[in-house]
């Protein structure tokens, strides 16, 4: 009885289509695969950024797989052929591993790359990224930002740079159609007549870096002798009400009374009849139902009541 063997895939490689970190892993079928024509051969693919402790593992019938990587580091991957037990009248047969690596040859020393890169998606509408020049780079150094997300044909360069002393230190992005809930890839590279500049790569999802506008139209309404309802409206813009969390800071007679986080545009406050002044501010943030992370908005304008009986008045700013 001949032992069944299968070859590893051929020409296993990592292909960089120029999408700033979104790479293709592809391979050719093993030789002599048509011996198993009635059988669906599968491939087990393992890959990771070099330095990561864990491999991502995929089992696929395809000859390619696509995923995002951190191009600041190298990538390693390995693959082997799997013949399911149905093909072999027994146990699963595996080929040996085929292995490959990929990395972008770094230019320049690490200190020359941009420092303190910070990107904020203002009100889920306007993306702005800013950075500081690398350490010790000369004024002739200029940085260029490129970006890509799935839906763009190719990486695009920033067309509206923020400048300081003639150097690009940030980018105002144009309207980014259908760009949230997917990986957004950025490369900031640089040029200098003096020395090579190290590129930096960044990946994030836009919904996770949203900084909303602050809430508006803060009001007080007396609900009962000892309760006041604080109300406000969602900020103007495209973010739906269901996506907000709010933080309220309430001061009674110059003493911080309450700091609370709520999901709705109201908060009911217990008060005493002796209250002479009541002020509150609110800020907003995208909640866990719409993102994995977010940035608190600025505080709203302060809304205050003072010097009159709260029971007799509804206050509207």
């Amino acid at each position: 009885d001949t032992e069944i063997k299968v070859n590893p895939p051929q020409d296993f490689e990592i292909v960089d289509p120029g999408y700033l970190g979104y790479l293709y892993l592809q391979w050719q079928p093993p030789l002599s695969l048509d011996h198993f024509k009635e059988c669906t051969v599968e491939y087990e693919l393992k890959y990771r950024n070099i330095g990561s402790e864990t491999w991502k593992t995929i089992i696929t019938k395809n000859l390619h797989y696509k995923d995002g990587f951190d191009l600041n580091k190298g990538i390693e991957a390995k693959i082997h052929t799997l013949l399911p037990w149905q093909c072999t009248n027994g146990s699963e047969v595996q080929s040996s591993w085929a292995e490959t690596t990929y990395w972008i040859s770094p230019q320049g020393i690490p200190e020359t790359k941009v420092q303190d890169m910070d990107c904020v998606y203002y009100n889920w509408q306007y993306l702005l990224c800013s950075w500081k020049p690398g350490i010790g780079v000369l004024l002739d150094t200029n940085y260029n930002l490129f970006y890509w997300y799935e839906g763009l044909d190719h990486a695009l360069q920033c067309v509206d740079y923020i400048k300081a002393d003639g150097q690009n230190i940030g980018c105002r992005f144009p309207y980014l159609e259908a760009s949230d809930y997917k990986d957004f890839y950025i490369c900031v590279n640089g040029s200098s007549e003096n020395k090579p500049i190290r590129s930096s790569y960044f990946t994030f999802q836009l919904q996770n870096i949203v900084k909303p506008l602050p809430p508006v139209y803060l009001t007080f309404t007396r609900e009962s002798s000892c309760e006041i309802k604080l109300k406000w409206s969602i900020p103007l813009g495209p973010i739906p009400a269901r996506c907000f969390d709010y933080e309220i800071e309430i001061r009674e007679d110059d003493t911080t009374l309450v700091t609370a986080t709520v999901e709705n545009e109201t908060y009911t406050l217990k008060t005493t009849n002796e209250t002479r002044q009541l002020c509150f501010v609110v800020r907003s943030k995208v909640n866990i139902y719409c993102s994995d992370d977010g940035i608190w908005s600025e505080w709203s304008d302060k809304q205050c009541w003072e010097g009159e009986d709260l029971s007799k008045k509804t206050l509207l700013r």
Epitope: Q10, D11, E13, I14, V15, P17, Y24, Q26, Q28, P29, L31, S32, L33, D34, H35, L63, H64, T100
Partner: antibody, heavy 118, light 107 residues
Framework: QVQLVQSGAEVVKPGASVKLSCKAS????????MSWVRQAPGQGLEWVAT????????YYPESVKGRFTITRDNSTSTLYMEMRSLRSDDTAVYYC???????????WGQGTLVTVSS | DIVMTQSPLSLPTTLGQPASISCKAS??????VAWYQQRPGQSPRALIY???YRYSGVPDRFSGSGSGTDFTLTISRVEAEDVGVFYC?????????FGGGTKLEIK
């Protein structure tokens, strides 16, 4: 449909260099390996070079190794072969061909005649 | 290098009759053999891969068989458009090698 359109005929002197091109359409170029095969006048087919879909792997026979270089530009779906130190026995029609998933060649270009003559 | 030896060199055939071409490999190439047809003045055209599987669009009168070192291309009923040179090729190992060709002619 799959099409491979090659550059025009070349006449060069011995020792010179030339670069052939092959523009592909009708398929996802970066997913396929590509090959060059040549045919000297009145002779059979001789394999000259193969490159993998991403360009990471290249293969040559001893007869051209070090003189011929196969490259590809996936952004323009174009295959190239640069031939240096040409000799009279390199005179042939050069075909580009798509390598199918089993390393056979399923589609072929129309051929480019390269004549090496003093 | 693996040498692929084809026979016969020339194959005069009558229209409607069968024809067979043999290809022998100098070492085991499993089933990693392809067959091509080159009509006069044209580029080669792929017929068979993995020794016995027809490419899409290839008439079913063409069939391939064999494994290891002995391979055969058979045309069940020769038609006028079949004239040309037929080549076998192994892709079991680099360098890829072709047979010397078999010229099919109509008697």
């Amino acid at each position: 449909q799959v099409q491979l359109v090659q550059s025009g005929a070349e006449v060069v002197k011995p020792g010179a260099s030339v670069k052939l091109s092959c523009k592909a359409s009708g398929f996802t170029f970066s997913s396929y390996g590509m090959s060059w095969v040549r045919q000297a006048p009145g002779q059979g087919l001789e394999w000259v070079a193969t490159i993998s879909g991403g360009g990471s792997y290249t293969y040559y026979p001893e007869s051209v190794k070090g003189r011929f270089t196969i490259t590809r530009d996936n952004s323009t779906s174009t295959l190239y072969m640069e031939m240096r130190s040409l000799r009279s026995d390199d005179t042939a029609v050069y075909y580009c061909a798509r390598r199918d998933l089993r390393s056979a060649m399923d589609y072929w270009g129309q051929g480019t005649l390269v004549t090496v003559s003093s | 290098d693996i040498v692929m030896t084809q026979s016969p060199l020339s194959l005069p055939t009558t229209l409607g009759q069968p024809a067979s071409i043999s290809c022998k490999a100098s070492q085991n190439v499993d089933i990693n053999v392809a067959w091509y047809q080159q009509r006069p003045g044209q580029s080669p055209r792929a017929l068979i891969y993995s020794a016995s599987y027809r490419y899409s669009g290839v008439p079913d009168r063409f069939s391939g068989s064999g494994s290891g070192t002995d391979f055969t291309l058979t045309i069940s009923r020769v038609e006028a458009e079949d004239v040309g040179v037929f080549y076998c090729q192994q892709y079991n190992a680099y360098p890829l090698t072709f047979g010397g060709g078999t010229k099919l002619e109509i008697k």
